[in-house]
């Protein structure tokens, strides 16, 4: 913490500008008024203060707003956001998507920090659900965001938000998460025709039950092996050889290369050898 010292004559800041750039820490503490700083926060980000100097500015804001910063200040934190702790952020009430975007921009290119995770949590809780615009924003900055949520948190995602999800956003999701997301996707895309529906639902199929896979097998979807390998084992096991053949279409030949891996291995063991032989792939049950 910077020692309290009087501001030298002529150094009192009349505005937040570049004249402060080479001020020592104690000079910033003594010569910058916290209320002035709060009203001119938008200027701070334009000035390349050192992180040490930003520490002093943060300290001034903390003294001015012990209960947490108002959103008018938060929106313009810029690099100062990197100085915030999760404890600081828990005091905030962030309601504007623009504020969220501004702060995520500062952290762009970095891994999701505890600060960012806390910020997102505060924002989403404040909104009550993960609406489409929020999800759009979060997955744009953090493609893995959706898969970082617990199944309980995912349950608050409305089906309408599913339209914002891209296949790469689901890359790291586990089956429990897809179990929650799949029914929402099914609902969101229910009015699409066969081939368009399959394109949209494909990345969510890791949460699909057997009956939906059976239904898809009747629609000439030609599922690729990568998608098939991500299906729930318990959903694949009851499928007949004929249904899997229809589901995969020309990709059925790929089963041979995957015969030692789940769910293909377990599925093969459940089939009659006669049925497997009809595929002509040399699969041994």
């Amino acid at each position: 913490e910077v020692e309290k010292t009087a501001c030298p004559s002529g150094k009192k800041a009349r505005e937040i500008d570049e004249s402060l750039i080479f001020y020592k820490k104690w000079e910033l503490e003594a010569c910058v008024d916290a209320a002035l700083l709060a009203t001119q926060m938008d200027r701070v980000n334009a000035i390349p203060f050192t992180y040490e100097q930003l520490d002093v500015l943060k300290h001034k804001l903390d003294e001015l707003y012990p209960q947490g910063y108002p959103e008018s200040v938060i929106q313009h934190l810029g690099y100062l956001f990197l100085k915030m702790s999760p404890e600081d952020i828990r005091k905030w009430n962030v309601t504007s998507l623009e504020t969220l975007k501004a702060l995520l921009e500062v952290n762009k290119g970095h891994e999701m920090s505890p600060q960012v995770a806390t910020l997102i949590d505060r924002f989403v809780k404040g909104r009550g659900q993960l609406d489409k615009d929020t999800l759009d924003t979060l997955t744009a900055f953090y493609p893995g965001y959706l898969c970082s949520l617990s199944p309980e948190e995912l349950s608050s995602v409305p089906p309408s938000s599913i339209w914002a999800v891209r296949p790469q956003d689901l890359d790291t999701c586990d089956p429990r998460q897809l179990d929650v997301l799949y029914p929402k996707a099914r609902l969101a895309f229910q009015n699409m025709n066969g081939s368009e529906y399959f394109v949209k639902i494909q990345s969510f199929l890791g949460g699909a039950p057997t009956e939906d896979l059976k239904a898809l097998s009747q629609q000439n979807v030609s599922m690729d092996l990568a998608t098939f390998m991500k299906l729930r084992t318990d959903a694949v096991l009851p499928l007949t050889v004929a249904e899997v053949q229809k589901l995969l279409g020309p990709h059925v030949e790929g089963l041979k290369a995957e015969e030692r891996h789940r769910p293909v291995r377990d599925w093969i063991l459940r089939q009659r050898q006669d049925d497997l032989d009809t595929l002509g792939l040399g699969l041994q049950g």
Epitope: F22, A46, E52, Q53, Y79, L82
Partner: nanobody, 124 residues
């Protein structure tokens, strides 16, 4: 490590001009900020002009606006201060200062480099 060497100071009559130069031993093209800071006798240091690489316009203290011009030549790693219509109150030691980086988020100080200064005396 960047070494800064100022030159161009001297004694000059009011109304005349001087051009200060600051030669850097290392590259200044990636510096976050470069400026001229002056310290008059018995007074505090004051930033008179600065180039913020993230901004579109240069900074000038109110007392020198319209009279001083800051510029740089990246190919020569040199910062300049053109001082016109000099006044007695411009008398000071002029330092060249360069900020290379912000430091480390969790503690380390930023890297600011300062020259030894060049004296400008405006007197009739």
């Amino acid at each position: 490590q960047v070494q800064l060497v100022e030159s161009g100071g001297g004694v000059v009559q009011p109304g005349r001009s001087l051009r200060l130069s600051c030669a850097a031993s290392g590259t200044i093209s990636e510096a976050l900020y470069m400026g001229w800071v002056r310290q008059a006798p018995g007074k505090e240091r004051e930033l008179v002009a600065g180039i913020n690489t993230g901004a579109t316009t240069n900074y000038y203290a109110d007392s020198v606006k319209g009279r001083f011009t800051i510029s740089r030549d990246n190919s020569k790693n040199t910062l300049y201060l053109q001082m016109n219509s000099l006044r007695a109150e411009d008398t000071a030691v002029y330092y060249c200062a360069v900020r290379k980086d912000r430091g480390v988020e969790n503690g380390g100080p930023g890297h600011d480099y300062w020259g030894q200064g060049t004296l400008v005396t405006v007197s009739s």
